[in-house]
Amino acid sequence: MAVTACQGLGFVVSLIGIAGIIAATCMDQWSTQDLYNNPVTAVFNYQGLWRSCVRESSGFTECRGYFTLLGLPAMLQAVRALMIVGIVLGAIGLLVSIFALKCIRIGSMEDSAKANMTLTSGIMFIVSGLCAIAGVSVFANMLVTNFWMSTANMYTGMGGMVQTVQTRYTFGAALFVGWVAGGLTLIGGVMMCIACRGLAPEETNYKAVSYHASGHSVAYKPGGFKASTGFGSNTKNKKIYDGGARTEDEVQSYPSKHDYV
């Protein structure tokens, strides 16, 4: 039960995280005009990964896409790549984790297969979250560097009293959305990996031994599985295998693990 809850919660947390990563990637407010200690302007600038926008006091907002690929800073391209990789991995992870969910039955899928899928999706979520966090952090670092550079030469004298005020940019809302979303995806991935450990049957689960008294045998299954009582003339020691747990001579049959789902 705890495993199902952990897996389900991991899935939901990752889903929210990936939705957040997508939202952050699409948002225009990755960097916003710094208003602190600046002349108050009737124009507000903000920039995203894909376009830059200007909002006037009049309420008019004008956005222009970055229609060049080669002319963009390498760092911006790197951030774009990291965010896209994060989204793609996260989306694949979600797809895999849907089939891996313990509460969803797909044919006669083995628990070991579900465990593997859970682990795979967990790793994908972790990498996805790390990509998003890395992308946002790279952009934030770029902003900090540019901020201090523009502060150093903020007022460029242009002969006498004429001055050019450089627009400084600070952290936009998308950065915080990205950090939180990346963190959630990471946490969700860790939860999926933890759930995988609970799903994976241990070696002892496969090799329980059935001891038969004369005409009466009791199979003890470790790990909290139900004991099963069988009657028959065969007194040989038998191995009970995961799944159908049929005996070698087909005399005894044991309940399948799937009966307890």
Partner: antibody, heavy 118, light 113 residues
Framework: QIQLVQSGSELKKPGASVKVSCKAS????????INWVRQAPGQGLEWMGW????????TYAEGFTGRFVLSWDTSVSTAYLQISSLKAEDTAVYFC???????????WGQGTLVTVSS | DIVMTQSPDSLAVSLGERATINCKSS????????????LTWYQQKPGQPPKLLIY???TRESGVPDRFSGSGSGTDFTLTISSLQAEDVAVYYC?????????FGGGTKVEIK
Amino acid sequence: QIQLVQSGSELKKPGASVKVSCKASGYTFTNYGINWVRQAPGQGLEWMGWINPNTGETTYAEGFTGRFVLSWDTSVSTAYLQISSLKAEDTAVYFCARLYYGNRFDSWGQGTLVTVSS
Amino acid sequence: DIVMTQSPDSLAVSLGERATINCKSSQSLLNSGNQRNYLTWYQQKPGQPPKLLIYWASTRESGVPDRFSGSGSGTDFTLTISSLQAEDVAVYYCQNAYYYPLTFGGGTKVEIK
């Protein structure tokens, strides 16, 4: 068409108060800000401040804080400029103007002459 | 506050001749975000409210005759009336539309010589 119609001329004594109105028509009042501009006799234009009826934001120029209050009433699509403790130097024509994109004042009221004299 | 300095204070030009008005701002009115210059030109005739002529330094307002043109960038701007007409006699104001307060220039009076 877009119109800004201001209230009529006012003759006031020093120390009194006056409230100038600016009624907007032909557009959605809350979508655009209203600016107020003062023009003393024979002088140039002086920006006083503006209100954004959508957000409730008001911005005043440095010399127009305290005695000058900008307000609005969305139900009647009207902006107001109230001046208290009137002084002789407040004698001027007061214009309201709509703030349109490009931060331009595209439509102006006809102006209201406020005369402060004892 | 941003200081807008207009020159000359008054200008007398013959009908059909070119009139040029200059406007200088104490800080750049060029917005890096959209590469637009937030400078506006108005015309005011006696007893009338100002009329918008040009915004974004060079974009003509609809209905404004094409003899009016604006140019310049950063801190230096120019309003040009290519062929002065009798109805162009007025006072012309430039305005900073970028920084608060949205200051106006002192005005340039255009008359017929």
